[in-house]
């Protein structure tokens, strides 16, 4: 049946603390994604910056999750608003910067 | 676009080994998706492996006892399928999108369809 928006959250962030513990050599080789504006609409726009990078493995579970909050398909080279266009990270220091934010809205009782 | 095989007739209790290949481009590159319809029902989610291989997620209906597995280097990926029962009766189906992760099976993406399916392959369970 449906995940609770809270479950789905939660595991979303389990997610990312894996990933930044695990983290051996640079995470998707140093690829550098889009930075994005952490706000309303946020899910969507993470997983348009994150579907731009091939063949990390390390990231399919995150843009899987992340799948789930987004209401519309994401294809690759699309872009919302929230893209920060002139500003790219590292994929290692997106996810930190997701994962805070993330904490924060768990925290807050913010679950969608 | 992908062609299943595999299917056939079993006793409850009974396993089969669902295969899926796509003979037009690389299944190595994309995660793949098991559905399956029974009669008169909308098509249901089964499974889905991601690329690589690393992330797998089941439909409760199937969870411990379908395994769902790839091999990167023949072009194939697989649905074992254990303990089956009559329920499980239905005509099986992968799907990709061409990307390399799996969708979100129950969250808000109703929006994330898959474009290209096989043309299924019948299994049933009866004694």
């Known amino acids: 049946g449906p995940v609770p928006p809270s479950t789905a959250l939660r595991e979303l962030i389990e997610e990312l603390v894996n990933i930044t513990q695990n983290q051996k050599a640079p995470l998707c080789n140093g690829s550098m994604v889009w930075s994005i504006n952490l706000t309303a609409g946020m899910y969507c726009a993470a997983l348009e910056s994150l579907i731009n990078v091939s063949g990390c493995s390390a990231i399919e579970k995150t843009q899987r999750m992340l799948s789930g909050f987004c209401p519309h398909k994401v294809s690759a080279g699309q872009f919302s608003s929230l893209h920060v266009r002139d500003t790219k990270i590292e994929v290692a220091q997106f996810v930190k910067d997701l994962l805070l934010h993330l904490k924060k809205l768990f925290r807050e009782g913010q679950f969608n | 676009q992908l062609v299943e095989s595999g299917g056939g007739s079993v006793q409850p209790g009974g396993s089969l080994r669902l295969s899926c290949a796509a003979p037009?481009?690389?299944?190595?590159?994309?995660?793949i998706a098991w559905f399956r319809q029974s009669p008169g029902k909308e098509r249901e989610w089964v499974s889905c492996i991601s690329r690589s291989g690393g992330d797998t997620i089941y439909s409760d209906s199937v969870k411990g006892r379908f395994t769902i597995s790839r091999d990167n280097t023949k072009n194939m990926v697989y649905l074992q399928m254990n303990s089956l029962n009559p329920e499980d009766t239905a005509v099986y189906y992968c799907?990709?999108?061409?990307?390399?992760?799996?969708?979100?099976?129950?969250?808000?993406?109703?929006?994330?369809?898959?474009?290209?399916w096989g043309q299924g392959t019948q299994v049933t369970v009866s004694s």
């Open positions: 037009r481009f690389t299944l190595g590159s994309y995660a």
């Open positions: 799907a990709t999108d061409k990307r390399s992760f799996c969708y979100a099976p129950n969250g808000l993406g109703k929006g994330w369809t898959y474009d290209y």
